[in-house]
């Protein structure tokens, strides 16, 4: 058998550190910011700046803080109870079906469009056809004109908790 | 020194059962959740189930809920994996395991099942 | 969820080689990942947990490293050395389920 690791080496969450707290749980959860101990007798507070947890629950291990990317603002660190909210830097924008990357906003909007929405931390600049007023889909082409926008204001945050 | 033996391993015919047992030493075992992970012959790992140090709270893989049952008695500092209704694709390795992390694997114990 | 590796990698001793775990669903990104080493005919063994951690006995050529980005983690030997010869399996943990790669055979040549 192997025999690797040793109570000392063990992570945090696994040792009865004197800054863990320790509770019961109840009906066999355990309260947000914490884990169920191995044995299920005891609450094991996550470790602040670490990891975290949502929700009361039978977890064995809290979830771990995300670490805002470069390309990315902290808008506010990771507790035991809540994950870091990240946001994208001005002029970049995440999009929900790629989350994990922060995109460039586009400067302009192609010929025969106009700008009508500005670029947000969540979403790139909203063009709309000069007649018809249909969305522009969101691909670029060749050729855009010099319609030119500033970064918008961020208006909340784009969190990336788990 | 933390040591794990597997045994119960076999024979046995599609649809059968058998009952795994691990002896554990050299460390507080009630203490410890533990696991049954297995692995079929040239294949890779894959976790079974697991019991918390109680013996409260028990876990299983969606390919054997309800088939098979992970008990533990921290007196005899044993743990058991019943196995009913045994399939084909339940031939492997079974390996117990220490500790939520995995930490510490016994040898392993041979099931194969087949007609 | 699962995770997925490189069936096998190949280095020749000396060199640095990395193992890659990509997860599905941002499962690496909000769970800690192990690493266990398989030599042929033996039980596995823990390298690495909690993500970067190293377990006493396991050499500091051994390093765990996560891109939350991809959404991958990675395990990178330095040094090789022909006993690194073996299976490797990343693995992690989601809502008290314990899930495993397919494993990444690396052959030092």
């Known amino acids: 058998e192997s025999a690797l690791i040793t109570q000392q080496d063990l992570a945090p969450q696994q040792r009865a550190a004197p800054q863990q707290k320790r509770s019961s749980p109840s009906e066999g959860l355990c309260p947000p910011g914490h884990h169920i101990s191995e044995d299920g007798r005891d609450c094991i507070s996550c470790k602040y700046g670490q990891d975290y947890s949502t929700h009361w629950n039978d977890l064995l291990f809290c979830l771990r803080c995300t670490r805002c990317d470069s390309g990315e603002v902290e808008l506010s660190p990771c507790t035991t109870t809540r994950n870091t909210v990240c946001q994208c830097e001005e002029g970049t924008f995440r999009e929900e079906d790629s989350p994990e990357m922060c995109r460039k906003c586009r400067t302009g909007c192609p010929r025969g469009m106009v700008k009508v929405g500005d670029c947000t931390p969540w979403s790139d600049i909203e063009c709309v056809h000069k007649e018809s007023g249909t969305k522009h889909s969101g691909e670029v082409p060749a050729v855009e004109e010099t319609v030119t926008s500033s970064p918008g204001t961020p208006a909340s945050p784009c969190s990336l908790s788990g | 020194e933390v040591q794990l033996l597997e045994s119960g391993g076999g024979l046995v015919q599609p649809g059968g059962s058998l009952r795994l047992s691990c002896a554990a030493s050299?460390?507080?075992?009630?203490?410890?959740?533990m696991s049954w992970v297995r692995q079929a012959p040239g294949k890779g790992l894959e976790w079974v189930s697991a019991?918390?140090?109680?013996?409260?709270?028990?876990y299983y893989a969606d390919s054997v809920k309800g088939r098979f049952t992970i008990s533990r008695d921290n007196s005899k500092n044993t743990l058991y994996l019943q196995m009913n209704s045994l399939r084909a694709e339940d031939t492997a390795v079974y390996y117990c395991?220490?500790?939520?992390?995995?930490?510490?694997w016994g040898r392993g114990t041979m099931v194969t099942v087949s007609s | 969820f699962m995770l997925t590796q490189p069936h096998s990698v190949s280095e020749s001793p000396g060199k640095t080689v990395t193992i890659s775990c990509t997860g599905s669903?941002?499962?690496?990104?909000?769970?800690?990942v192990q690493w266990y080493q398989q030599r042929p005919g033996s039980a596995p063994t823990i390298v690495i947990y909690e993500d970067n951690r190293r377990p006493s006995g396991v050499p500091g050529r051994f390093s765990g490293s996560i891109d939350r980005s991809s959404n991958s983690a990675s395990l990178t030997i330095s040094g090789l050395q022909t006993e690194d010869e073996a299976d490797y399996y990343c693995?992690?943990?989601?809502?008290?389920?314990?899930?495993f790669g397919g494993g990444t055979k690396l052959t030092v040549l």
């Open positions: 693995q992690s943990y989601n809502y008290n389920t314990w899930v």
């Open positions: 019991i918390s140090g109680s013996g409260g709270s028990t």
């Open positions: 669903s941002g499962s690496v990104a909000r769970n800690y």
């Open positions: 395991v220490k500790g939520a992390w995995l930490d510490y």
């Open positions: 050299g460390f507080t075992f009630s203490s410890y959740a």
